[in-house]
Interface confidence: medium
Protein backbone atom coordinates (compact mmCIF):
# COMPACT_ATOMS: atom_id res chain seq x y z
CA UNK A 1 0.00 0.00 0.00
CA UNK A 2 1.49 3.31 -1.08
CA UNK A 3 1.02 6.37 1.10
CA UNK A 4 0.15 9.44 -1.01
CA UNK A 5 1.57 12.69 0.34
CA UNK A 6 0.91 15.20 -2.42
CA UNK A 7 -1.30 15.95 -5.39
CA UNK A 8 1.64 15.32 -7.72
CA UNK A 9 2.29 11.92 -6.13
CA UNK A 10 -1.38 11.02 -6.58
CA UNK A 11 -1.36 11.94 -10.28
CA UNK A 12 1.93 10.07 -10.81
CA UNK A 13 0.53 6.95 -9.11
CA UNK A 14 -2.54 7.00 -11.39
CA UNK A 15 -0.29 7.47 -14.43
CA UNK A 16 2.08 4.68 -13.40
CA UNK A 17 -0.79 2.23 -12.87
CA UNK A 18 -1.50 2.02 -16.61
CA UNK A 19 -4.34 -0.46 -17.18
CA UNK A 20 -4.30 -1.73 -13.59
CA UNK A 21 -7.11 -1.05 -11.16
CA UNK A 22 -6.22 1.55 -8.52
CA UNK A 23 -8.00 1.52 -5.15
CA UNK A 24 -7.69 4.67 -3.04
CA UNK A 25 -8.50 4.72 0.66
CA UNK A 26 -9.26 8.25 1.89
CA UNK A 27 -8.99 8.20 5.66
CA UNK A 28 -7.95 10.16 8.74
CA UNK A 29 -6.06 9.27 11.91
CA UNK A 30 -8.99 10.41 14.08
CA UNK A 31 -11.53 8.28 12.17
CA UNK A 32 -12.49 5.12 14.09
CA UNK A 33 -14.03 3.18 11.15
CA UNK A 34 -10.92 4.03 9.08
CA UNK A 35 -8.69 2.39 11.68
CA UNK A 36 -11.01 -0.61 11.79
CA UNK A 37 -10.82 -1.35 8.07
CA UNK A 38 -7.15 -0.44 7.54
CA UNK A 39 -5.73 -3.94 8.31
CA UNK A 40 -8.27 -5.45 5.93
CA UNK A 41 -7.32 -2.93 3.24
CA UNK A 42 -3.68 -3.93 3.69
CA UNK A 43 -4.56 -7.64 3.51
CA UNK A 44 -6.37 -7.02 0.20
CA UNK A 45 -3.20 -5.46 -1.19
CA UNK A 46 -1.47 -8.81 -0.60
CA UNK A 47 -4.38 -10.84 -1.93
CA UNK A 48 -4.80 -8.79 -5.13
CA UNK A 49 -1.21 -8.31 -6.28
CA UNK A 50 -2.35 -7.04 -9.71
CA UNK A 51 -4.20 -4.10 -8.12
CA UNK A 52 -2.59 -0.82 -6.94
CA UNK A 53 -3.59 0.24 -3.42
CA UNK A 54 -3.14 3.85 -2.31
CA UNK A 55 -3.81 5.58 1.00
CA UNK A 56 -4.58 9.27 1.33
CA UNK A 57 -4.72 10.98 4.72
CA UNK A 58 -7.28 13.75 4.16
CA UNK A 59 -5.59 16.04 6.70
CA UNK A 60 -2.14 15.67 5.16
CA UNK A 61 -3.46 15.87 1.58
CA UNK A 62 -6.38 18.26 1.68
CA UNK A 63 -5.85 19.24 -1.95
CA UNK A 64 -6.20 15.62 -3.15
CA UNK A 65 -9.26 15.02 -0.95
CA UNK A 66 -10.82 18.25 -2.22
CA UNK A 67 -10.11 17.47 -5.88
CA UNK A 68 -11.55 13.97 -5.44
CA UNK A 69 -14.61 15.47 -3.69
CA UNK A 70 -14.24 13.35 -0.58
CA UNK A 71 -16.89 14.31 1.95
CA UNK A 72 -16.65 11.59 4.60
CA UNK A 73 -14.29 8.89 5.80
CA UNK A 74 -13.45 6.29 4.91
CA UNK A 75 -14.16 6.79 1.23
CA UNK A 76 -12.89 4.29 -1.32
CA UNK A 77 -12.41 5.37 -4.90
CA UNK A 78 -11.54 3.12 -7.83
CA UNK A 79 -9.62 4.25 -10.91
CA UNK A 80 -8.71 2.69 -14.23
CA UNK A 81 -6.63 4.54 -16.82
CA UNK A 82 -6.91 7.67 -14.62
CA UNK A 83 -10.69 7.55 -14.84
CA UNK A 84 -12.83 7.09 -11.73
CA UNK A 85 -14.84 3.90 -12.21
CA UNK A 86 -16.33 3.49 -8.75
CA UNK A 87 -16.71 4.94 -5.28
CA UNK A 88 -18.39 4.30 -1.96
CA UNK A 89 -18.11 5.51 1.61
CA UNK A 90 -18.10 3.52 4.82
CA UNK A 91 -15.99 0.79 6.42
CA UNK A 92 -17.66 -2.05 4.55
CA UNK A 93 -15.21 -4.93 4.04
CA UNK A 94 -17.49 -7.06 1.88
CA UNK A 95 -18.41 -4.22 -0.45
CA UNK A 96 -14.76 -3.23 -0.76
CA UNK A 97 -13.69 -6.68 -1.89
CA UNK A 98 -16.78 -7.16 -4.05
CA UNK A 99 -16.09 -3.88 -5.86
CA UNK A 100 -12.46 -4.84 -6.47
CA UNK A 101 -13.63 -8.14 -7.97
CA UNK A 102 -16.13 -6.32 -10.17
CA UNK A 103 -13.57 -3.90 -11.54
CA UNK A 104 -10.27 -5.79 -11.62
Amino acid sequence: VKQIESKTAFQEALDAAGDKLVVVDFSATWCGPCKMIKPFFHSLSEKYSNVIFLEVDVDDCQDVASECEVKCMPTFQFYKKREKVGEFSGANKEKLEATINELV
Epitope: E94, K95, A98, V104
Partner: antibody, heavy 117, light 105 residues
Framework: EVQLQQSGAELVKPGASVKLSCTAS????????MHWVKQRPEQGLEWIGR????????KYDPKFQGKATITADTSSNTAYLQLSSLTSEDTAVYYC??????????WGQGTSVTVSS | QIVLTQSPAIMSASPGEKVTMTCSAS?????MYWYQQKPGTSPKRWIY???KLASGVPARFSGSGSGTSYSLTISTMEAEDAATYYC????????FGAGTKLELK
Protein backbone atom coordinates in the same frame (compact mmCIF):
# COMPACT_ATOMS: atom_id res chain seq x y z
CA GLU B 1 -29.50 -13.37 11.95
CA VAL B 2 -29.23 -12.77 8.21
CA GLN B 3 -32.11 -14.13 6.14
CA LEU B 4 -33.32 -13.77 2.57
CA GLN B 5 -37.03 -14.48 2.19
CA GLN B 6 -38.24 -15.01 -1.37
CA SER B 7 -41.76 -14.74 -2.74
CA GLY B 8 -43.85 -17.81 -3.51
CA ALA B 9 -44.01 -20.09 -6.54
CA GLU B 10 -45.37 -18.68 -9.79
CA LEU B 11 -47.28 -20.37 -12.63
CA VAL B 12 -47.32 -18.06 -15.63
CA LYS B 13 -48.34 -18.19 -19.28
CA PRO B 14 -45.89 -17.95 -22.18
CA GLY B 15 -45.28 -14.35 -23.24
CA ALA B 16 -46.20 -12.96 -19.85
CA SER B 17 -43.92 -11.29 -17.26
CA VAL B 18 -43.28 -12.09 -13.62
CA LYS B 19 -41.70 -10.14 -10.76
CA LEU B 20 -40.02 -12.03 -7.94
CA SER B 21 -39.07 -10.50 -4.61
CA CYS B 22 -36.36 -11.13 -2.05
CA THR B 23 -36.69 -9.44 1.33
CA ALA B 24 -33.61 -9.26 3.52
CA SER B 25 -33.49 -9.21 7.29
CA UNK B 26 -30.52 -8.96 9.64
CA UNK B 27 -28.60 -6.58 7.35
CA UNK B 28 -29.10 -3.51 5.19
CA UNK B 29 -29.12 -4.31 1.46
CA UNK B 30 -27.48 -0.93 0.79
CA UNK B 31 -24.30 -2.36 2.32
CA UNK B 32 -23.67 -4.99 -0.35
CA UNK B 33 -24.55 -6.35 -3.78
CA MET B 34 -27.63 -8.52 -4.24
CA HIS B 35 -27.33 -11.27 -6.85
CA TRP B 36 -29.85 -13.45 -8.70
CA VAL B 37 -29.08 -16.99 -9.86
CA LYS B 38 -31.13 -19.30 -12.10
CA GLN B 39 -31.35 -23.08 -11.85
CA ARG B 40 -33.34 -25.00 -14.44
CA PRO B 41 -34.76 -28.43 -13.43
CA GLU B 42 -31.93 -30.95 -13.01
CA GLN B 43 -29.46 -28.36 -14.31
CA GLY B 44 -26.63 -26.23 -12.96
CA LEU B 45 -26.47 -22.69 -11.61
CA GLU B 46 -26.43 -19.63 -13.86
CA TRP B 47 -25.58 -16.13 -12.65
CA ILE B 48 -28.20 -13.67 -13.94
CA GLY B 49 -26.87 -10.42 -12.56
CA ARG B 50 -26.60 -8.19 -9.54
CA UNK B 51 -27.61 -4.81 -8.18
CA UNK B 52 -25.89 -2.34 -5.89
CA UNK B 53 -28.99 -1.19 -3.97
CA UNK B 54 -27.17 1.90 -2.68
CA UNK B 55 -27.26 3.47 -6.15
CA UNK B 56 -29.35 1.14 -8.32
CA UNK B 57 -26.34 0.22 -10.45
CA UNK B 58 -26.91 -3.14 -12.17
CA LYS B 59 -24.82 -5.65 -14.08
CA TYR B 60 -26.15 -8.62 -16.07
CA ASP B 61 -24.74 -11.67 -17.73
CA PRO B 62 -25.11 -10.77 -21.45
CA LYS B 63 -27.28 -13.88 -21.86
CA PHE B 64 -29.94 -12.35 -19.59
CA GLN B 65 -29.77 -8.78 -20.91
CA GLY B 66 -33.27 -7.86 -22.06
CA LYS B 67 -34.80 -10.87 -20.31
CA ALA B 68 -34.12 -9.91 -16.69
CA THR B 69 -34.45 -6.62 -14.84
CA ILE B 70 -33.11 -6.32 -11.31
CA THR B 71 -34.33 -3.54 -9.03
CA ALA B 72 -34.25 -2.81 -5.33
CA ASP B 73 -36.28 -0.86 -2.78
CA THR B 74 -34.05 0.13 0.12
CA SER B 75 -36.99 1.34 2.22
CA SER B 76 -38.37 -2.22 2.38
CA ASN B 77 -34.91 -3.87 2.17
CA THR B 78 -36.11 -5.83 -0.85
CA ALA B 79 -34.55 -6.80 -4.17
CA TYR B 80 -36.63 -7.75 -7.20
CA LEU B 81 -36.13 -9.77 -10.36
CA GLN B 82 -38.49 -9.16 -13.26
CA LEU B 83 -38.52 -11.65 -16.14
CA SER B 84 -40.23 -10.71 -19.40
CA SER B 85 -41.51 -12.49 -22.52
CA LEU B 86 -41.48 -15.80 -20.69
CA THR B 87 -40.93 -19.10 -22.51
CA SER B 88 -40.49 -22.69 -21.36
CA GLU B 89 -36.73 -21.98 -21.15
CA ASP B 90 -37.47 -19.68 -18.22
CA THR B 91 -39.00 -22.49 -16.15
CA ALA B 92 -36.58 -22.70 -13.25
CA VAL B 93 -35.90 -21.97 -9.61
CA TYR B 94 -34.58 -18.45 -9.09
CA TYR B 95 -32.40 -17.67 -6.09
CA CYS B 96 -31.46 -14.33 -4.64
CA UNK B 97 -28.08 -14.43 -2.95
CA UNK B 98 -25.70 -12.38 -0.91
CA UNK B 99 -22.44 -13.61 -2.45
CA UNK B 100 -19.80 -12.51 0.00
CA UNK B 101 -16.08 -12.97 0.35
CA UNK B 102 -14.54 -13.32 3.80
CA UNK B 103 -17.96 -13.29 5.47
CA UNK B 104 -20.67 -15.94 5.14
CA UNK B 105 -22.69 -16.36 1.94
CA UNK B 106 -26.47 -16.28 2.19
CA TRP B 107 -29.04 -17.59 -0.28
CA GLY B 108 -32.81 -17.30 -0.36
CA GLN B 109 -34.90 -20.49 -0.38
CA GLY B 110 -35.59 -20.07 -4.10
CA THR B 111 -38.71 -19.22 -6.07
CA SER B 112 -40.04 -21.74 -8.57
CA VAL B 113 -41.32 -20.26 -11.83
CA THR B 114 -43.24 -22.53 -14.19
CA VAL B 115 -44.11 -21.28 -17.66
CA SER B 116 -47.02 -23.20 -19.09
CA SER B 117 -50.15 -22.51 -21.13
CA GLN C 1 -16.58 -14.30 -19.97
CA ILE C 2 -14.82 -17.08 -18.10
CA VAL C 3 -16.08 -20.61 -18.71
CA LEU C 4 -15.63 -23.17 -15.92
CA THR C 5 -15.45 -26.83 -16.95
CA GLN C 6 -15.97 -29.41 -14.22
CA SER C 7 -14.98 -33.04 -14.39
CA PRO C 8 -16.19 -35.61 -14.00
CA ALA C 9 -19.88 -34.75 -14.45
CA ILE C 10 -20.91 -37.70 -12.30
CA MET C 11 -18.85 -39.88 -9.98
CA SER C 12 -19.46 -42.37 -7.22
CA ALA C 13 -17.37 -43.23 -4.19
CA SER C 14 -17.53 -45.69 -1.32
CA PRO C 15 -17.32 -44.57 2.31
CA GLY C 16 -13.69 -44.03 3.28
CA GLU C 17 -12.54 -43.52 -0.30
CA LYS C 18 -10.57 -40.43 -1.41
CA VAL C 19 -12.46 -38.20 -3.87
CA THR C 20 -11.05 -35.53 -6.18
CA MET C 21 -13.00 -33.39 -8.62
CA THR C 22 -11.57 -30.69 -10.85
CA CYS C 23 -12.56 -27.36 -12.32
CA SER C 24 -10.78 -25.81 -15.28
CA ALA C 25 -11.16 -22.11 -16.12
CA SER C 26 -10.95 -20.76 -19.67
CA UNK C 27 -8.79 -17.85 -18.41
CA UNK C 28 -6.61 -17.29 -15.36
CA UNK C 29 -8.52 -16.44 -12.20
CA UNK C 30 -7.31 -15.39 -8.77
CA UNK C 31 -9.59 -17.45 -6.53
CA MET C 32 -12.06 -20.29 -6.83
CA TYR C 33 -15.22 -20.87 -4.80
CA TRP C 34 -17.03 -24.18 -4.36
CA TYR C 35 -20.67 -24.79 -3.46
CA GLN C 36 -22.42 -27.92 -2.25
CA GLN C 37 -26.06 -28.50 -3.18
CA LYS C 38 -28.40 -31.27 -2.16
CA PRO C 39 -31.75 -31.89 -3.93
CA GLY C 40 -34.47 -29.40 -3.03
CA THR C 41 -32.14 -27.08 -1.10
CA SER C 42 -30.27 -23.86 -1.82
CA PRO C 43 -26.54 -24.07 -2.61
CA LYS C 44 -24.18 -23.71 0.35
CA ARG C 45 -20.76 -22.12 0.08
CA TRP C 46 -18.30 -24.90 0.84
CA ILE C 47 -14.86 -23.51 0.00
CA TYR C 48 -13.80 -19.91 -0.62
CA UNK C 49 -10.55 -18.20 -1.63
CA UNK C 50 -9.56 -21.51 -3.31
CA UNK C 51 -8.66 -23.34 -0.10
CA LYS C 52 -10.51 -21.90 2.90
CA LEU C 53 -13.32 -24.00 4.35
CA ALA C 54 -16.62 -22.27 5.02
CA SER C 55 -17.99 -22.40 8.54
CA GLY C 56 -19.17 -25.89 9.51
CA VAL C 57 -17.47 -27.69 6.63
CA PRO C 58 -15.68 -30.86 7.82
CA ALA C 59 -11.88 -30.86 7.76
CA ARG C 60 -11.86 -33.85 5.37
CA PHE C 61 -12.60 -31.35 2.58
CA SER C 62 -9.84 -29.35 0.98
CA GLY C 63 -9.44 -27.08 -2.02
CA SER C 64 -6.40 -26.22 -4.07
CA GLY C 65 -5.24 -24.82 -7.38
CA SER C 66 -4.14 -21.67 -9.15
CA GLY C 67 -4.32 -20.00 -12.54
CA THR C 68 -6.75 -22.07 -14.59
CA SER C 69 -6.71 -25.38 -12.71
CA TYR C 70 -8.52 -26.02 -9.41
CA SER C 71 -9.70 -29.01 -7.43
CA LEU C 72 -11.83 -30.07 -4.47
CA THR C 73 -10.74 -33.14 -2.51
CA ILE C 74 -12.46 -35.23 0.15
CA SER C 75 -9.86 -37.25 2.05
CA THR C 76 -12.33 -39.92 3.17
CA MET C 77 -15.80 -40.02 1.66
CA GLU C 78 -18.77 -40.08 4.03
CA ALA C 79 -22.44 -40.71 3.19
CA GLU C 80 -23.40 -37.11 3.95
CA ASP C 81 -20.95 -35.86 1.28
CA ALA C 82 -23.17 -37.18 -1.52
CA ALA C 83 -24.30 -34.02 -3.31
CA THR C 84 -23.60 -31.88 -6.36
CA TYR C 85 -20.58 -29.60 -6.15
CA TYR C 86 -20.29 -26.45 -8.24
CA CYS C 87 -17.16 -24.40 -8.80
CA UNK C 88 -17.65 -20.66 -9.10
CA UNK C 89 -15.49 -17.70 -10.05
CA UNK C 90 -16.13 -14.07 -9.23
CA UNK C 91 -14.54 -11.96 -11.89
CA UNK C 92 -16.40 -9.03 -13.41
CA UNK C 93 -19.01 -11.52 -14.66
CA UNK C 94 -19.40 -14.39 -12.18
CA UNK C 95 -19.92 -17.88 -13.60
CA PHE C 96 -20.54 -21.39 -12.29
CA GLY C 97 -19.34 -24.75 -13.54
CA ALA C 98 -21.95 -27.31 -14.67
CA GLY C 99 -21.42 -29.29 -11.47
CA THR C 100 -20.03 -32.65 -10.37
CA LYS C 101 -22.62 -35.02 -8.96
CA LEU C 102 -21.04 -37.15 -6.25
CA GLU C 103 -22.97 -40.32 -5.46
CA LEU C 104 -22.48 -42.84 -2.68
CA LYS C 105 -21.41 -46.25 -3.99
Amino acid sequence: EVQLQQSGAELVKPGASVKLSCTASGFNIKDTFMHWVKQRPEQGLEWIGRIDPANGNTKYDPKFQGKATITADTSSNTAYLQLSSLTSEDTAVYYCALLQYSAMDYWGQGTSVTVSS
Amino acid sequence: QIVLTQSPAIMSASPGEKVTMTCSASSRISYMYWYQQKPGTSPKRWIYDTSKLASGVPARFSGSGSGTSYSLTISTMEAEDAATYYCHQRSSYPTFGAGTKLELK
